[in-house]
Amino acid sequence: YSHWPSCCPSKGQDTSEELLRWSTVPVPPLEPARPNRHPESCRASEDGPLNSRAISPWRYELDRDLNRLPQDLYHARCLCPHCVSLQTGSHMDPRGNSELLYHNQTVFYRRPCHGEKGTHKGYCLERRLYRVSLACVCVRPRVMG
Amino acid sequence: YSHWPSCCPSKGQDTSEELLRWSTVPVPPLEPARPNRHPESCRASEDGPLNSRAISPWRYELDRDLNRLPQDLYHARCLCPHCVSLQTGSHMDPRGNSELLYHNQTVFYRRPCHGEKGTHKGYCLERRLYRVSLACVCVRPRVMG
């Protein structure tokens, strides 16, 4: 069980909403995926994990913040602008785009709590939405009607 | 703004749920859904959200648990066993498999806390990993060595 340190105010502590505020403002959007400089990595393997066998392969990039729960998040980064041919596993097929799938994940930030006279009273948890890229997906390009 | 839900009530503090209620918005993926003529069909659309334009299309299924945070999680469910042809958007290509991408997401369960003499002292949050399927990915089948 996780008993969060002083995320609930103690007796007599000011429980104003200022103290335990939270925000649902998404963190600024991540940079669009760029194809990897090394063209040899833009291929679909016949073994290994899902992200390397995908015809829209991707790698993971660590995003660590010790004041956030979870502390470690991983962002997908597409290795190819287009999908890789199912036949060869290496040549790109311009009829398909490799696009990032995004998700707004609930995370919690540890923030100092302040008591009656502005004294530090442990830590509060601030809930936020954090934009992560989960994977790269091979899609048909949009046809604008 | 919101008060954190009674994860560590202190001595003498009123831990009634009225006091400790808080609001949130379910966190689905970013792109709004568009109508899909055949919502459960195995085809790759040329418009609409990523999950219907993918050549490994999927739908989302709600998983709701009122004692968990987030309360609403969405599991991807693949609509095709194989990938859809980039050319036609409808015929399946047996050279590619549509596979679920899984992720162990950090969630929090609300559990009763117990005080000094086993008395109920509000709620604690228990941190756990919960397996969710994020998307369906078009992959080359594994070649066993």
Epitope: - | E17, L20, P29, P32, R59, Y60
Partner: antibody
């Protein structure tokens, strides 16, 4: 003002399909889950399923054995209920209902459409 | 699925009376219970959510109580406009389920 306006009454033959629409206005359509509830003559309310307009995520009542499909058109702020393989016992009023919520406490259908009468005979 | 059972199925009371309707769940649902009012020929309306919280615009003569498996809807002083069928609904687990309804009439 929040409003849910449903399509008109339908008369169908057994084995046919029906598609009922529910146009929402007065709030952010993508921000609230939409429920569908049926009321057969003289019967209790029966929950059919829900859909999150934001991602098309659904949950269905298995009592309908896969005959129900829920969809949305966010650009038109409209939710749809499709019921296949109709039988006489599907006769009733079909309601769409917006779901409000507050974590740890409630999920409640706070606004309802006027209902669509579907007659199967 | 969780079964919801209301009692009585119908009742008749006089204006000014205190009226009580009960709702029982087949398993514990904490406080995850709503009450709806459906007037004759009308659409259901949310009355009470989360066992005891009054929805906006609902008169204070309505109140709800209970926890676990047994719940009560009370009208402290019955008014003519309260003639309706009342439904309880659990949302502890999907699928949502409703009680069979209690039809309230004026004597």
């Amino acid at each position: 003002e929040v409003q849910l306006v449903e399509s008109g009454a339908e008369v169908k033959k057994p084995g046919a399909s029906v598609k009922v629409s529910c146009k929402a206005s007065g709030y952010s359509f993508s921000g609230y889950t939409m429920n569908w509830v049926r009321q057969a003559p003289g019967q209790r309310l029966e929950w059919m399923g829900l859909i999150n307009p934001y991602n098309g995520g659904t949950s269905y009542n298995q009592n309908f054995k896969g005959r129900v499909t829920l969809t949305v058109d966010t650009s038109a702020s409209t939710a749809y209920l499709e019921l296949n393989s109709l039988r006489s016992e599907d006769t009733g009023v079909y309601y769409c209902a917006r779901e409000d919520f507050d974590s740890w406490t409630y999920f409640a259908m706070d606004y309802w459409g006027q209902g669509t009468l579907v007659t199967v005979s | 699925d969780i079964q919801m059972t209301q009692s009585p199925s119908s009742l008749s009371a006089s204006v000014g009376d205190r009226v009580t309707i009960t709702c029982s769940a087949s398993q514990g649902i904490s406080n995850y219970l709503n009450w709806y009012q459906q007037k004759p020929g009308k659409v259901p309306k949310l009355l009470i959510y989360y066992t005891s919280s009054l929805h906006s615009g609902v008169p204070s003569r309505f109140s709800g109580s209970g926890s676990g498996t047994d719940f009560t809807l009370t009208i402290s002083s019955l008014q003519p406009e309260d003639v309706a069928t009342y439904y309880c609904q659990q949302y502890s687990k999907l699928p949502y389920t409703f009680g069979q309804g209690t039809k309230l009439e004026i004597k």
